[in-house]
């Protein structure tokens, strides 16, 4: 560790004095310490000579030696006083700078030690400190106000009484910066826009920060505009808005806009599109199918994308049957707005019943006309299923008819004995009928379909079953002859009617 | 061995504000007294002004539109230059100030052009 | 204007002693301390004389300062081609309470 001659850790002179500080070191020394007037530095070897020969209360302060060299980084300190009756004061600093909740250390240096108990800080022209403003003193460094607010940004000065009157320092102005969490926050309004040649147009580009050091700007397709701008503070923050307005738009002004706001601590930008279209439009579209097909008794929504510009003049569902002169009901419509010129609408249509099933139109319109998109929905049914005994040509014939949707297929199954649905055990004999006669497929409506099986002899301990089945589920009738007639038997489980 | 570097933009509008950055490296920028000085092209050297701690001292004559900070915590110190025209157009130094006023310690100086 | 006079320029041929002059006032030179500076084309200046006649450490002893009265100068012996810059004198200024340069001096090795 260096040692400095004198070896006193304060040294207090008169203006004019001579002074020499020297410091001696292992290796090479320096001298750090206030700049100020008249100090003269001699370096030999490892030795290092401060000196003035004429003092002034601006040599005030505290020189510090150190050794560079030294991995340790010691180094040894001696407070200097030049007490000059007319001076009280060494002011270090016009200004100081710090952010909120640092201390500011407001450095007037006292000339003299004696002041200690005299001293105050103040504002300038005598007016009193805010209100909490928690500060203390060091004679060798000055005034420190801990946990500096920026409402205590003011121009101060140090005072210290001397025979009776107090003597103020020049001033000290104080920068308490807010602290700055990150780029000024950004809104460009709108998020999209959309005009139709020679409208007009307005792009306002504003952010904000709790310090007014920023800068904002708006650029149209990589080119700065030269906006005017405006300022305005509220809310404790900063805030600066452009405003690009257009009175008649043309096609050079659509694409890209982007606002962009920077300070010390970075940048942020946000961008927008603006596009240019010679006429009105109007756009409907559905991410699903307008062929739908649902289980009766199941439920669905219907979902309509809407691009129009201008906004919508009129909207509605409409059901064009073929069942009912049935209108959707409106609570079970509604609109969606994904942003200024995207809408989506929705039918919802609960617990499907087979008087719903049919075409689904959803209509709109705006100055450019009006649009429809229409659905399609066909109500799945499983197959119910009956079986009669009747001659055809001569010939006895089991005749089965199968309803449902979609298409049903039909088998036929001879078990051996008496029951309502034949087991694999029973099964004596299975036909297939891959092309059963198809008697009525309407659109909207269940397909019947009908299949012949031809029977030279009906045997009586046996059991003929007709059973048919879809992606729905399936349905059966057992034929079960009886010397007295036919008599035949739907499954007990029979179908749910909704 | 201490070493400074400026940095900022090399261009900078009329009226606009004109910021630098000094890094220091290779010891604290809590000791010392840390300067700002610049050199239109062709012309001689103009003190703008020190900072030791969070406190500057600056040029009587360009006080009103400097300011000068310290981030201790990352061993910089920068300068703020308001309201600059093509008077400012210089090469910026930052340099360590020593207690006979000597600027012992240089950065290699960085070219600051105001211009529309 | 600068507040310390220099001569805008000097000349000397190899191993010739030239010297730059620096002038001031009371509020400057003549109370205070003056430093030189070199400044070789395209670079930083640096420190060549403190204290009105000490060098920093890596200063050839062939670069000596004075100074007398409001006034100081810089004397170079065995003038060599490297030495060719330009060089400025400064001292604090008691009425601005800053260093002050002067214009600088350009010398030529001829």
């Known amino acids: 560790i260096p040692v400095i001659e004198p070896s006193v850790p304060e040294l207090v002179v008169k203006p004019g004095a001579t002074v020499t500080l020297r410091c001696v070191g292992n290796g090479s020394v320096e001298w750090d310490g206030p700049p100020s007037p008249h100090w003269t530095l001699y370096s030999d070897g490892s030795s290092s000579i401060l000196s003035t020969n004429n003092a002034t209360f601006q040599n005030t302060g505290t020189y510090r030696c150190t050794e560079p060299g030294d991995p340790l980084g010691g180094s040894a300190a001696i407070h200097l006083y030049v007490k000059d009756p007319a001076r009280p004061w060494n002011v270090l600093a016009q200004e100081v700078v710090v952010f909120e909740d640092q201390d500011a250390l407001l450095p007037c240096l006292l000339t003299d030690p004696v002041l200690e108990a005299g001293v105050s800080l103040v504002r300038v022209r005598g007016r009193p400190l805010m209100r909490h403003t928690n500060y203390s003193f060091s004679p060798w460094h000055g005034f420190t106000i801990h946990r500096a607010k920026f409402i205590q940004s003011q121009d101060y000065q140090c005072s210290a009484l001397m025979g009776g009157r107090k003597v103020m320092s020049i001033s000290i102005r104080l920068k308490v910066q807010k602290v700055i969490p990150g780029p000024p926050a950004l809104t460009l309004v709108p998020a999209e826009l959309v005009r139709i040649r020679g409208e007009a147009a307005q792009i306002v580009c504003s952010a904000s920060s709790v310090d007014v050091n920023f800068d904002v700007f708006l650029q149209h397709n990589n080119t700065k505009l030269a906006i005017p701008q405006q300022s305005d503070f509220h809310n404790n923050r900063y805030q600066k808005v452009l405003t690009l307005n257009l009175d008649q738009v043309d096609f050079q002004h659509a694409g890209n806009y982007s606002c962009v706001a920077s300070n010390v601590q970075g940048k942020h930008s946000t961008s927008m599109f603006f596009r240019v279209v010679e006429s009105a439009y109007l756009n409907l579209s559905s991410e699903q199918n307008l062929i739908q097909e649902v289980t009766v008794g199941e439920g669905l929504n219907l979902k309509v994308m809407v691009e129009a510009y201008p906004g919508l003049q009129g909207f509605n569902w409409t059901y064009l049957g073929p069942f009912s002169d049935h209108q959707p009901e409106p609570k079970l419509a509604n609109a969606t707005t994904k942003d200024t010129y995207r809408h989506t609408f929705t039918l919802s249509l609960p617990r499907l019943k087979p008087s719903e099933a049919g075409r689904y139109s959803f209509l709109a319109r705006n100055p450019g006309g009006w649009r429809a998109l229409t659905f399609e929905l066909t109500l799945r049914y499983p197959p119910e299923v009956s079986v009669i005994w009747t001659f055809i040509n001569g010939s006895g014939t089991l005749l089965c008819a199968a309803s449902g949707y979609p298409q049903p297929n039909v088998t036929w199954l001879q078990c051996s004995g008496h029951t309502d649905r034949c087991d694999e055990a029973q099964v004596l004999q299975v036909w297939d009928d891959p092309y059963p006669e198809v008697l009525s497929q309407e659109p909207f409506h269940k397909v019947t379909v009908q299949s012949l099986l031809t029977v030279e002899t009906l045997e009586h301990n046996q059991t003929y079953e007709c059973r048919a089945h879809n992606s729905v589920g399936s349905g059966s009738w057992a034929f079960i002859p009886i010397s007295a007639g036919a008599h035949t038997h739907p499954p007990d489980e029979f179908l749910f009617t909704p | 061995q201490v070493q400074l570097q400026e940095s900022g933009p090399g261009l900078v509008k009329p009226s606009e504000t004109l910021s630098l950055t000094c890094t220091v490296s290779g010891g604290s920028i809590s000791s010392y007294y840390w300067s700002w000085i610049r050199q239109p092209p062709g012309k001689g050297l103009e003190w703008i002004g020190y900072?030791?701690?969070?406190?500057?001292t600056k040029k009587p004559s360009l006080k009103s539109r400097v300011t000068i900070s310290v981030d201790t915590s990352k061993n910089q110190f920068s300068l703020k230059l308001s309201s600059v025209t093509a008077a400012d157009t210089a090469v910026y130094y930052c340099?360590?100030?020593?207690?006979?006023?000597?600027?012992?310690?240089w950065g290699q100086g960085t070219m600051v052009t105001v211009s529309s | 204007q600068s507040v310390l006079t220099q001569p805008p320029s000097a000349s000397g041929t190899p191993g010739q002693r030239v010297t730059i002059s620096c002038s001031g006032s009371s509020s400057n030179i003549g109370s205070n301390t003056v430093n030189w500076y070199q400044q070789l084309p395209g670079t930083a200046p640096k420190l060549l004389i403190y204290s009105n006649n000490q060098r920093p450490s890596g200063v050839p002893d062939r670069f000596s300062g004075s100074k007398s009265g409001t006034s100081a100068s810089l004397a170079i012996s065995g003038l060599q081609s490297e030495d060719e810059a330009d060089y400025y004198c400064?001292?604090?200024?008691?009425?601005?309470?800053?260093?002050?340069f002067g214009g600088g001096t350009k010398l030529t090795v001829l």
């Open positions: 400064a001292a604090w200024d008691d009425s601005l309470n800053g260093p002050v």
């Open positions: 340099a360590r100030s020593t207690v006979v006023n000597a600027f012992d310690i």
């Open positions: 900072i030791y701690y969070s406190g500057s």
